[in-house]
């Protein structure tokens, strides 16, 4: 019996929702791979749960993941990178729920950075460019790109272009004069693998010139 | 169809390395992992090693491991497995196998190749 | 690592019989695979994950257990059916047990 709970324990146990989701980043760290997964109910007793990876791994069997907070992880070099592995929540020896993920299916890029915009006077436009540690990788290296913008007093009014350069035009005539804007960028995997949005870059914030030409007039957003 | 054509018999004195080819047709080559197998006369199955061609990562078996090494050619959906160092207990038949990573199991086999170890 | 023991070594029946083949695990496996293979040829898949048929494979075999003991059963033998039969663990090393040999009586 050594390793499981006691049996009122398990009974109860059988009877919380233990629905769980995860996402990898490859080559997060050097040539290591990340594997984060989280319940997706914030109120479970996560005292005794633990989870486990089996399967699809480089010369081991299974790997136990790091309890961090509400979150669990695994850094390791040792992911196949093909075909399903079987991840488990566990109550010792016992699986309360498994499921089977690839895990070039649920990957999630690190987020864009060094986002910038420098307006160009003679070209009346603005020219938007980030970075992404991803242009370095072996595996992750296609990404689609989100970039949102808004002007500041507008609270949920976000323009979203999608690209797959690092490098975006804005014409001015398509902004507002004088006007402050807040731009981001988040990128997805778009090619062989797959997954989910990154985390946003941190925000850059940007003001449009006043208007300065005969006309007066701007196109609207 | 689905077919993984091996390169032909081989003999060979202990000591030497062997090489053998496995040519995969009729799916998506870096979509499966390709499995290696040996067979000595008369006896079962052994799991050597296998590869995941679209990254190059190899899963050795212990056994084998520093003797046994998997590459393949993407441009020619062409795997390999070259063993050293042979001894006469390393005569069998070898096969190549493609593994549906979905499940596990190894779910189309190549002919097999005789590899002959005698002094 | 685990070993995989089949059970018995040989079996020896009449087409038309029922063939049950055991295979016992020395610690506990998530799936178990069954391959058949005759004398001269490549093993073919026959059931994968316990239970599930693999492509071309008729209804006569079916695979069940769970934890350290499996079976693989063959309902009416056919003639085609005279075989050595493998099962084989999911995960890492990717075991084989020693084989169990089905001979016409």
């Known amino acids: 019996e050594s390793g499981y709970a006691q049996n009122g324990d398990l009974e109860d146990a059988e009877l919380d929702d233990y629905s769980f989701s995860c996402y990898s980043q490859l080559e997060v760290n050097g040539s290591q791979h990340s594997l984060t997964c989280a319940f997706e109910d914030p109120d479970v007793n996560i005292t005794n749960l633990e989870f486990e990876i089996c399967g699809a791994l480089v010369e081991v069997k299974c790997l136990n993941f790091r309890k961090l907070q509400e979150i669990y992880f695994i850094e390791t070099k040792k992911f196949l990178l093909i075909g399903k592995s079987n991840i488990c929540v566990k109550v010792g020896e016992k699986s309360l729920t498994c499921k089977k993920i690839d895990l070039t299916t649920i990957v999630k890029p690190e987020a864009p950075f060094d986002l910038s915009v420098v307006y160009r006077e003679g070209a009346n436009d603005f020219v938007v460019t980030f970075n992404t540690s991803h242009l370095q990788k072996k595996y992750v290296k296609v990404l689609m790109h989100d970039v949102a913008y808004r002007q500041e007093k507008d609270e949920n009014k976000w323009t979203h272009v999608n690209l797959s350069s690092t490098k975006l035009t804005l014409l001015q005539r398509k902004l507002q004069p004088a006007a402050m804007y807040e731009i981001k960028v988040r990128s997805i995997p778009d090619h062989y693998f797959k997954g989910f949005w990154s985390e946003w870059s941190p925000s850059y914030y940007f003001r449009t010139p006043e208007i300065n030409n005969s006309s007066g007039e701007m196109d609207p957003i | 169809q689905v077919q993984l054509v091996q390169s032909g018999a081989e003999v060979k004195k202990p000591g030497a390395s062997v090489k053998v080819s496995c040519k995969a047709s009729g799916y998506t080559f870096t979509g499966y992992t390709m499995n290696w197998v040996r067979q000595a006369p008369g006896q079962g199955l052994e799991w050597m090693g296998l590869i995941n061609p679209y990254n190059g990562v190899t899963s050795y078996n212990q056994k084998f491991k520093g003797r046994v090494t998997l590459t393949r050619d993407t441009s020619i959906s062409t795997a390999y497995m070259e063993l050293s160092r042979l001894r006469s207990d390393d005569t069998a038949v070898y096969y190549c196998a493609r593994g549906d990573g979905n499940y596990w199991y190894v779910d189309v086999w190549g002919q097999g190749t005789t590899v002959t170890v005698s002094s | 690592e685990i070993v995989l023991t089949q059970s018995p070594a040989t079996l020896s029946l009449s087409p038309g019989e029922r063939a049950t083949l055991s295979c016992s695990a020395s610690s506990s496996v998530t799936y178990m695979h069954w391959y058949q293979q005759k004398p001269g040829q490549a093993p073919r898949p026959l059931i994968y994950?316990?239970?599930k048929l693999a492509s071309g494979i008729p209804a006569r075999f079916s695979g069940s257990g769970s934890g350290t003991d499996f079976t693989l059963t063959i309902s009416s033998l056919e003639p085609e059916d005279f075989a050595v039969y493998y099962c084989?663990?999911?995960?890492?090393?990717?075991?084989f047990g020693g084989g169990t040999k089905v001979e016409i009586k």
């Open positions: 994950e316990i239970s």
């Open positions: 084989q663990e999911w995960n890492y090393p990717y075991t």
